[in-house]
Interface confidence: low
C-alpha cells in the first residue's frame, strides 16, 4: 500500500496506538524507497512542527505526551521540483493512550466461541467517553471506533465481531476518548482473549482411575489425539477459567496431556480442546463431555465459579 506517483506513504511502527511515555517510529516511504522527508502535524495548519528538521528513513517520536496525539503527514524530498518537496502523504492518526481511567471489556455470549459465530464485545465505563476504540493485539491498522451510548451514568459501545474466523481470534483491548480530544485515549481495558473453537478434530477425554471415584481419591483427566496439538485446554462447566498443559508425544503416536485434579471433592462436567503453538487462540472442536462423579461426598455444593483472570493469557504462547 504505497502512495501515488507523487504522494509518499506515511506509516507508524509498531502501531498507531502509543502508550503515554512510549515511542513510535514514523516512516515516510516515497518513490520506492525511504528518502529525506519532512513531517507535519495537521492541526498546526501544515506548518512543520519539527522545526524544519529533515529526517532520513524514519523518525522516532517520543516519549509521547497527549500533545502528540493527532493527524500527521509527511512530504518526501524532490530536489528538482519547484518546492523541493512532494505532495503531502496520506494522513496518519497517532493515538496516545493512558489519559483516562480504563474502561471495562466484556464478551457476549462469552469469550469462547465456535467458528462462524458472532461475538459482541461491549466496552463500557462510568467515565463519559464520547468514542470507544477496539484494538486487537499485534495488528498495526487503526483500531475500530464507535460512538458511545450514554445511559444511566454509563457510556458504552457494542462492537460486533463475526462471523468468527481464525484471523479474528486474539487478544482485544478497548479504550475511550472524551469529547474534543478524540485521539487522547484512556488506559487500555484489561485484555480479553477471544478464542475460536471448532477448527480441528476433537480430542478424546478420559479419567483415571475412572469417571466415578470415591471422595478423596486422586483423579487425573487425560486429553489425547492423533493430531499433533501443542497444547491442551481443559474446561469445567460452570467455571470461567481453563487449565492448560503442553501436549506430550506418546509411544503410540498420540499427543497427550494429563491434568491432575488432585483428591476428588466435587464432580463436574469437563471438556478439552487442542491448539497449536502458532495459533494459540484457535482451538479444536470440543471433546465429548466427560461427567466425573464423586461418591461418598458429604457435601454436594460446588465451589463458586471463578472469574476469568485478566492475566489469563490464553492467547499468549506457553513457553
Amino acid at each position: 500500500l504505497m502512495g501515488g506517483q507523487d504522494k509518499p506513504f506515511l506509516s507508524a511502527r509498531p502501531s498507531t496506538v502509543v502508550p503515554r511515555g512510549g515511542h513510535v517510529a514514523l516512516q515516510c516511504h516515497y518513490r520506492r524507497g525511504f528518502n529525506n522527508f519532512m513531517l507535519y502535524k495537521e492541526d498546526r495548519s501544515h506548518v512543520p512542527i519539527f522545526h524544519g528538521r529533515i529526517f532520513q528513513e524514519s523518525f522516532i517520536m517520543g516519549p509521547v505526551t497527549p500533545a502528540h496525539a493527532g493527524t500527521y503527514r509527511c512530504r518526501g524530498s524532490r530536489p528538482h521540483s519547484l518546492t523541493g518537496w512532494s505532495a503531502p502523504s496520506n494522513p496518519l492518526v497517532i493515538m496516545v493512550t493512558g489519559n483516562h481511567r480504563k474502561p471495562s471489556l466484556l464478551a457476549h455470549p462469552g469469550p469462547l466461541l465456535k467458528s462462524g459465530e458472532t461475538v459482541i464485545l461491549q466496552c463500557w465505563s462510568d467515565v463519559m467517553f464520547e468514542h470507544f476504540f477496539l484494538h486487537r493485539e499485534g495488528i498495526s491498522e487503526d483500531p475500530s471506533r464507535l460512538v458511545g451510548q450514554i445511559h444511566d451514568g454509563v457510556s458504552k459501545a457494542n462492537f460486533s465481531i463475526g462471523p468468527l474466523m481464525p484471523v479474528l481470534a486474539g487478544t482485544y483491548r478497548c479504550y475511550g476518548s472524551v469529547p474534543h480530544s478524540p485521539y487522547q485515549l484512556s488506559a487500555p481495558s484489561d485484555p480479553l482473549d477471544i478464542v475460536i473453537t471448532g477448527l480441528y478434530e476433537k480430542p478424546s477425554l478420559s479419567a483415571q482411575p475412572g469417571p466415578t471415584v470415591q471422595a478423596g481419591e486422586n483423579v487425573t483427566l487425560s486429553c489425547s489425539s492423533w493430531s499433533s496439538y501443542d497444547i491442551y485446554h481443559l474446561s469445567r462447566e460452570g467455571e470461567a477459567h481453563e487449565r492448560r498443559l503442553r501436549a506430550v508425544p506418546k509411544v503410540n503416536r498420540t499427543f497427550q496431556a494429563d491434568f491432575p485434579l488432585g483428591p476428588a471433592t466435587h464432580g463436574g462436567t469437563y471438556r478439552c480442546f487442542g491448539s497449536f503453538r502458532a495459533l494459540p487462540c484457535v482451538w479444536s472442536n470440543s471433546s465429548d463431555p466427560l461427567l466425573v462423579s464423586v461418591t461418598g461426598n458429604p457435601s454436594s455444593s460446588w465451589p463458586s465459579p471463578t472469574e476469568p483472570s485478566s492475566k489469563s493469557g490464553i492467547c499468549r504462547h506457553l513457553h
Epitope: 464520547e130 475500530s144 460512538v147 451510548q149 450514554i150 445511559h151 462492537f159 460486533s160 469529547p179 474534543h180
Partner: antibody, heavy 120, light 107 residues
C-alpha cells in the same frame, strides 16, 4: 411516546444563513445523540453530523464541516443546526434523527423534515 | 470513509412478488447496518437494525441478512404499501454513510 418535531420550511437567498430546530419529547434528551441528515431533491440521504446534548460535543461529515454548526439547548430539549453561506445546492430537506440504544443501534426516530430552499 | 453500494437502483415488481435488495460495504462493517423505508414526501422509517433484527412493528415479510461486507434486505410477498424507496446505512464509525437507495415500483 418519542417525537421529534422540526421547524417549518424556509426560503433563503444565496449567502444567507438558516437555523433549523428539532424539538425532542418523550425521552431523556441528554441520553441520546442527535444526528442530522440531508436529502437534496430527487437524491438519496447524506449524513451531516451529530451532537451529544449531554456534552455539547459535535462531529461532522467532512463534506459539511464549514457549512453547519450544531447546538443543543437541554433546557428545552431542542437541537439546532445552522447552515451558513447558503448556495442553491444547499436546497434540500433536512432531517434530525435520534441514534437509538442497545445492540448496534440505528436511527430509531426521525423528525418530519424541514425543507430549505435557496433561491435568488 | 466507508462507501455503501446499493443495488439495484430501481426495481419493478408486482404485488405478491419476493424482492431482494443488496448493499455492499467497501470494508467489513461487522453487521453495523440498518435498512430504512422512505415514502414520497415522508421521513425514512427504520425496518431492520444490526443487519438482521426487525424493528418494532415491522411486518415479518421483511427480513435482513448478511455479514462482513455483503448485506441483503428481502421482502416476501410484496404488499401495495411496500412500494417505496429503501436505503441501507452503516454505523461502523463516522461518517455514517447511506447506500444510494433502491426505488421499488409497481410493474
Amino acid at each position: 411516546q418519542v417525537q421529534l418535531v422540526q421547524s417549518g420550511a424556509e426560503v433563503k437567498k444565496p449567502g444567507a444563513s438558516v437555523k433549523v430546530s428539532c424539538k425532542a419529547s418523550g425521552y431523556t434528551f441528554t441520553s441520546y445523540t442527535m444526528h442530522w441528515v440531508r436529502q437534496a431533491p430527487g437524491q438519496g440521504l447524506e449524513w451531516i453530523g451529530y451532537i451529544n446534548p449531554s456534552s455539547g460535543y459535535t462531529e461532522n461529515n467532512r463534506k459539511f464541516k464549514d457549512k453547519t454548526t450544531m447546538t443543543a439547548d437541554t433546557s428545552t430539549s431542542t437541537a439546532y443546526m445552522e447552515l451558513s453561506s447558503l448556495r442553491s445546492e444547499d436546497t434540500a430537506v433536512y432531517y434530525c434523527a435520534r441514534l437509538g440504544k442497545g445492540l448496534l443501534p440505528p436511527f430509531d426516530y426521525w423528525g418530519q423534515g424541514t425543507t430549505v430552499t435557496v433561491s435568488s | 470513509d466507508i462507501q455503501m453500494t446499493q443495488s439495484p437502483s430501481s426495481l419493478s415488481a408486482s404485488v405478491g412478488d419476493r424482492v431482494t435488495i443488496t448493499c455492499r460495504a467497501s470494508e467489513n462493517i461487522y453487521s453495523n447496518l440498518a435498512w430504512y423505508q422512505q415514502k414520497q414526501g415522508k421521513a425514512p422509517q427504520l425496518l431492520v437494525y444490526a443487519a438482521t433484527n426487525l424493528a418494532d412493528g415491522v411486518p415479518s415479510r421483511f427480513s435482513g441478512s448478511g455479514s462482513g461486507t455483503q448485506y441483503t434486505l428481502t421482502i416476501n410477498s410484496l404488499q401495495p404499501e411496500d412500494f417505496a424507496t429503501y436505503y441501507c446505512q452503516h454505523f461502523w464509525g463516522t461518517p455514517y454513510t447511506f447506500g444510494g437507495g433502491t426505488k421499488l415500483e409497481i410493474k
